[in-house]
């Protein structure tokens, strides 16, 4: 699931999530994450994979929050 395109690059935090991924991304594939802008119509956590893909996820999913905690701790 891609985020809205941006002229400033694929990971610019002004992007919004319009749909969420329906599958759990393996933790080892994730390099970084960011939260979408609070002005977006729906919230989103964007995970950036080691291959450079941006994946929109639902912040209310437990695995998403678990990954965020893990990345904050490490």
């Amino acid at each position: 699931t891609k985020t809205e395109s941006s002229s400033r690059g694929p990971y610019h935090p002004s992007e919004c999530c319009f749909t969420y991924t329906t599958y759990k991304i393996p933790r080892q594939r994730i390099m970084d994450y960011y939260e979408t802008n609070s002005q977006c119509s729906k919230p989103g956590i964007v995970f950036i994979t080691k291959r450079g893909h941006s994946v929109c996820t639902n912040p209310s999913d437990k695995w998403v929050q678990d990954y965020i905690k893990d990345m904050k701790e490490n």
């Epitope: 969420y20 329906t22 729906k42 912040p59 209310s60 999913d61 437990k62 965020i68």
Partner: antibody
């Protein structure tokens, strides 16, 4: 494990609503709290939630006038909603979940709810 | 946004009978659906999550099924205590609830 909402009451249009959810028997550091409301005779409506790490998220309709905060030391979560109108008349529930059901929106611990009436 | 349309109220069943409540989503929600029971003056009680999994402490006479956009809650061997309003919730997209279906037990 339980959650309880503070007293609601009668509000005037344009007032600001502040409700507090007090949790007992568990820590907010491992639980998320949702706010949901129900207008008389109507279905349930999600307002927003705060995660176990303290980040708040909102329904699109509520975002512009709602704020959810927490005090982990006192085990309380507060909902503040500004610019009330008659359409905000409802029973307001706080509900908790620890993610056991794979998603924090799925709540198995609910308060009894508190009635908020907005009328001039 | 997803819209959830439930079976119109009321739905009646005799004690010992079977009740079926349907919940139709306006788009696929990948089994991210929960069912709640709510009695008059009480908060909702979680019954089913992920479309078909029974929440802790819920009697096995409650069964959830479905996929894609069509979901069903079935109550077999209905008891007087099952008289309530049943609501579905999607948590795939925006955390939307259905309008509720009242079940009357005769």
């Amino acid at each position: 494990q339980s959650v309880k909402e503070s007293e609601g009451g009668l509000f005037k249009p344009a007032d600001t609503l502040t409700l507090t959810c007090t949790v007992s028997g568990f820590s907010l550091s491992s639980f998320a709290i949702n706010w949901v409301r129900q207008a008389p005779g109507e279905g349930l409506e999600y307002i927003g939630w705060i995660s176990d790490v303290g980040t708040a998220y909102y329904a699109s309709w509520a975002k512009s006038r709602s704020t959810i905060t927490r005090n982990a030391d006192e085990n309380t979560v507060t909902l503040k909603m500004t610019s009330l109108t008659a359409a905000d008349t409802a029973t307001y529930f706080c509900a908790g979940g620890d993610g056991s059901y794979s998603n924090y929106w799925v709540s198995d611990i609910w308060g009894q709810g508190t009635l908020v009436t907005v009328s001039s | 946004a997803v819209v959830l349309t439930q079976t119109a109220s009321p739905v009646s069943a005799p004690v010992g009978g079977t009740v079926t409540v349907k919940c139709q989503a306006s788009q696929t929600i990948n089994n991210r659906l929960a069912w709640y029971q709510q009695k008059q003056g009480q908060p909702p009680k979680l019954l089913i999550y992920e479309a078909s999994k029974l929440a802790s402490g819920v009697p096995s006479r409650f069964k959830g099924s479905g996929s894609g956009t069509e979901y069903t809650l079935t109550i077999r061997g209905v008891e007087c205590a099952d008289a309530a309003t049943y609501s579905c919730q999607e948590y795939a997209d925006e955390n939307i609830f259905g309008g509720g279906t009242e079940v009357v037990v005769k």
